[in-house]
């Protein structure tokens, strides 16, 4: 009797998660990514904000920059020059789009402990970076690129045609930032800093999205962004390279575009330096099923870049678009001509291939009914990559090492058995020459970051183990999570189910489907999270399910490319199929089923609610796409083709939320959007609302004034509180 009484008292001290816990970030975790500066040294910002240099081999550490210096300019970020003579300090951070921001930069001279005076940097700067060797600086100011030989020198202006919203040099425009490069920069130093490559984006002919920003003034401001929607005029891109030692000699030299790409609309997709005098550019046709990788060499005699046809490698997809979400980038080997790259094998699984001369003669390095996800590093004798091979769980990530110095190459899983229950989803960060590396485990247990020897894989030390979080969770009744699969009509639907702490299979529970479902996404992952849905399960007794249906990633091309040219069909069908299977499990109250999603997930949740199945009582769409004609060209056309009569206009028209307005009559619908959403424009929700009003369908709506796609800050609290009330009302749960 006594043990059970003790057990009960322990149970009584346990508490459920509260919404406040989630909104306050009480159970957030930390990761540790070393800022590598050599094979055996890294920088890290300590808890008291000193910048500390750690030497793994000597075990010594010392402060290179004090928190006092950081605070003197209100620095929120820093960057050490490769020659270790200077540090840039970043302050006045001002966010623009997803990756882009402007900031003020100060240069601190470590040799004399003073800020560099004279020839100070202008403000605000759009992007700044050190050369890979020495302490040259490249920066972008007012859409033009400048070079500094040393921080105290006057700048050399490389471009002169930069113009707001018209010509972008060294930084991407909106669509390239969000949908192609996924960076705030579009300039790349050669390995030793001899050359600087950059992109110029000409947005002169792109239609502009305009929306009101209400602010606090008497009149709202109008925000104008050149934003190509599906089928519209796209940015015109050109790539230039300039010699940074003699920048005025011949000036920036344009890199030629492969003829087969230049014959119609095209994109530049990435640039990879191989050596100081060899560069690799990737190009993509506007119809994104053909990608060309072009290797170019510097011609000293002409001071130009030569891209011979023999060094063009074509990647083409016959079943969908090229690549996964993006076309993969090459990782070059030490011979500076052959490279490793991930692309689909003959069975339709993304795997690592070694290309020496032609893509046709590529040697497949990995194979199986799983996918290689990222190549981290290639050294003289090893290749490190991540995959979801282990135990056939697509939502896991383990790190592998292939020995490429020996034949046949041997493969070793570095992470599979380290902390098997706690850690099934890893990423890694390597020092120079992979002498050491950090592993960052994201779950399913509490995240942990560790340091390892690159030769032996031996764990050297724990960098971050989230002890405080572990202690804080000791008296919390967390929901149970399970990852399983459904086999339906030759399709495998992996799902994650989040169950209330005292889950009882004989009882009936309300079900909430959380959906994203976008092409090449993955929601069912073995990662740790204490978030809103954890609270809904822990405190409100809901069952939450996430399902990866057709169109999602890392399970082969058959699943991935199933949605090609017909977005909004199979993603929705598969959520509905899963719900029916969940009902069959016996513990779901089929009168209390809801669905919610954000962005692409808002689109899918809206279509699911309007599917006419009668399965869903209610649902929420946050910042949904409502018609693919309203979304960005680069993203939309990748999966849908063009909205023209001779291409795919019919499906563009058939796949809108508005076309299904009538079907919302029998569900409770909550539509939410930020009015300053630069990504999925408020227009999308405005059109849904208009269609519902025209159909005389009642619905609920919430807008967030001056908020973007992320609905951040105080809006986040309001949003989740509002959605919680809506769901509790829908599920008849007392407040």
């Amino acid at each position: 009797l006594r043990p059970s009484r003790v057990h009960n008292s322990e149970e009584n001290t346990m508490r459920a998660l509260t919404l406040k816990d989630i909104l306050n970030g009480t159970f957030s975790y930390k990761t540790f990514f070393p800022n590598w500066i050599s094979g055996q040294e890294y920088l890290h910002q300590s808890a008291d904000n000193n910048i500390v240099l750690y030497n793994i081999e000597t075990g010594q550490s010392y402060t290179i920059l004090s928190n006092r210096t950081m605070k003197s300019v209100n620095a929120s970020n820093y960057g050490l020059s490769p020659d270790r003579q200077f540090v840039y300090l970043e302050s006045d951070y001002s966010k623009l789009w997803r990756y882009s921001y402007t900031a003020t930069y100060y240069i601190y001279d470590l040799s004399n402990g003073e800020f560099v005076r004279g020839n100070e940097l202008p403000r605000p700067i759009q992007y700044l970076c050190w050369s890979p060797v020495g302490s040259k600086l490249a920066y972008v100011y007012q859409n033009n690129i400048y070079l500094k030989q040393r921080p105290g020198d006057p700048p050399f202006q490389i471009t002169f045609n930069g113009r707001e919203n018209k010509i972008f040099n060294g930084i991407p425009d909106w669509v390239y930032e969000e949908e192609m490069l996924a960076t705030k920069y579009a300039l790349w130093w050669s390995p030793n800093g001899k050359f600087l490559a950059y992109a110029e984006f000409n947005d002169t002919d792109i239609p502009v999205i305009a929306y009101s920003y209400y602010g606090d003034e008497q009149y709202p401001r109008t925000i104008n962004i050149p934003y190509p929607k599906a089928g519209a005029k796209n940015p015109v891109v050109r790539i230039f390279i300039i010699d940074t030692t003699y920048p005025a000699y011949v000036g920036p030299q344009e890199v030629p575009v492969p003829a087969m790409i230049a014959s119609s609309d095209y994109y530049f997709s990435w640039l990879t330096w191989v050596t100081d005098e060899r560069v690799c550019l990737q190009w993509l046709k506007r119809v994104q099923n053909v990608s060309v990788l072009s290797i170019c060499d510097f011609r000293e005699d002409w001071q130009t870049w030569d891209c011979p046809k023999t060094q063009e490698h074509i990647e083409e997809s016959r079943t969908g678009w090229a690549g996964g979400f993006f076309v993969s980038t090459p990782v070059f080997s030490y011979d500076a001509i052959s490279y490793y790259k991930i692309f689909s094998d003959k069975d339709g699984y993304k795997h690592i291939h070694y290309i020496k001369d032609t893509v046709e003669n590529a040697i497949q390095i990995t194979s199986g009914k799983w996918e290689a996800i990222n190549i981290f590093r290639v050294t003289q004798d090893s290749l490190f990559y991540s995959s979801n091979e282990f135990e056939e769980y697509p939502g896991r990530r383990n790190i592998y090492r292939i020995s490429i110095g020996s034949y046949p190459p041997s493969k070793k899983c570095v992470t599979c058995h380290l902390r098997k229950e706690r850690c099934q989803y890893y990423t890694a960060s390597f020092s120079d020459y992979a002498k050491y590396y950090a592993l960052v485990c994201y779950g399913p247990g509490i995240p942990i970051s560790t340091l390892h020897d690159g030769r032996t894989d031996q764990e050297i030390k724990i960098l971050e183990e989230n002890k405080e979080l572990e202690n804080a969770l000791k008296n919390i009744q967390l929901p149970k999570e399970e990852i399983k699969k459904l086999e339906v009509d030759e399709i495998t639907l992996w799902y994650k189910m989040i169950l209330p702490p005292q889950f009882d299979r004989s009882k009936k529970y309300p079900l909430l489907i959380q959906v994203y479902g976008g092409p090449c996404s993955q929601s069912v992952r073995s990662v740790f999270a204490v978030n809103w849905i954890s609270y809904l399960a822990s405190k409100e007794g809901m069952v939450i399910a996430l399902v990866d249906g057709r169109g999602t990633a890392f399970q082969g091309d058959k699943l991935l490319y199933a949605v090609y040219r017909k977005l909004g069909v199979y993603e929705v069908e598969d959520q509905i199929t899963a719900v029916r299977k969940f009902i069959e499990m016996g513990f779901i109250d089929e009168k209390r089923i809801a669905i919610w999603g954000w962005s692409y997930g808002g689109y899918v949740s809206s279509l699911a609610l309007a599917s006419g199945t009668g399965l869903f009582k209610c649902g929420i769409a946050v910042a949904p796409v409502s018609s693919w004609e309203y979304y960005a060209s680069v993203y939309t056309e990748r999966f849908m083709g063009l909205p023209t009569k001779d291409d795919n206009l019919e499906h563009y028209k058939n796949s809108t939320v508005m076309a299904r307005a009538e079907y919302f009559r029998n569900v409770d619908y909550l539509l939410i959007h930020g009015t300053a959403d630069d990504n999925v424009h408020f227009q999308n929700s405005a059109q849904i609302a208009k269609a519902l009003v025209n159909a005389q369908v009642d619905f609920q709506a919430m807008w967030y004034s001056d908020q973007n796609h992320g609905l951040s800050g105080l809006s986040t609290n309001h949003l989740y509180t509002h959605m919680t009330h809506f769901l509790k009302q829908c599920f008849s749960l007392s407040d």
Epitope: D153, T245, A248, Y249
Partner: antibody, heavy 118, light 107 residues
Framework: EVQLVESGGGLVQPGGSLRLSCAAS????????MSWVRQAPGKGLEWVSW????????GYADSVKGRFTISRDNSKNTLYLQMNSLRAEDTAVYYC???????????WGQGTLVTVSS | DIQMTQSPSSLSASVGDRVTITCRAS??????LNWYQQKPGKAPKLLIY???SLQSGVPSRFSGSGSGTDFTLTISSLQPEDFATYYC?????????FGQGTKVEIK
């Protein structure tokens, strides 16, 4: 503080040789293009030669090509100009200057006078 | 080679005057044009680089403008220490060339 100090000037006979030196301090010498500029008495400025940061790349004015050789020793932070087959028209004050970005001369030495006369 | 032609070759002006010196290149040099001041027995001193950028420490009464082939140096209000010879210089193609100079004398 950037300093450039020239030395090695003097009187030399036509056809003779002279080696000028320029000692640099106050900046990272090995990172910059360096140059020689001359000024004949009462005349304007004339660029003579430049040398790249690593020392492998050089440029010369047509008037001195084949006779003058520019070099540098980055370990000693020193720039040199070897002048052979000197002519009367080479008489000038020779300035050592830093040629920033290969475009403008941002720092100059005080100059050293070379007189070519019999 | 790119030839640089300065005008006038000399000028007389008084303290407080606005002085303009022009420089023309024989072909387009974009904005790779620099201005120097030289006083007797001294080394030249950089005033303006890249056509319009003021070198650190140079008084703001000096300004530069132009691009392509035609450039101007302006001294908004001539000071006693500004009496000197001024040279323009182009920095294209790693073959720097100077103008013949403009001597600014006291009226």
């Amino acid at each position: 503080e950037v300093q450039l100090v020239e030395s090695g000037g003097g009187l030399v006979q036509p056809g003779g040789s002279l080696r000028l030196s320029c000692a640099a301090s106050g900046f990272t010498f090995r990172g910059y293009i360096m140059s020689w500029v001359r000024q004949a008495p009462g005349k304007g400025l004339e660029w003579v030669s430049w040398i790249g940061p690593e020392g492998s790349r050089t440029g010369y004015a047509d008037s001195v090509k084949g006779r003058f050789t520019i070099s540098r020793d980055n370990s000693k932070n020193t720039l040199y100009l070897q002048m052979n087959s000197l002519r009367a028209e080479d008489t000038a004050v020779y300035y050592c200057a830093r040629l920033l970005y290969g475009t403008w001369f941002d720092y100059w030495g005080q100059g050293t006078l070379v007189t070519v006369s019999s | 080679d790119i030839q640089m032609t300065q005008s006038p070759s000399s000028l007389s002006a008084s303290v407080g005057d606005r002085v303009t010196i022009t420089c023309r290149a024989s072909q387009s040099i974009s904005s790779y044009l620099n201005w120097y001041q030289q006083k007797p027995g001294k080394a030249p001193k950089l005033l303006i680089y890249a056509a319009s950028s003021l070198q650190s420490g140079v008084p703001s009464r000096f300004s530069g403008s132009g691009s392509g082939t035609d450039f101007t140096l302006t001294i908004s209000s001539l000071q006693p220490e500004d009496f000197a010879t001024y040279y323009c210089q182009q920095g294209r193609l790693l073959l720097p060339t100077f103008g013949q100079g403009t001597k600014v004398e006291i009226k």
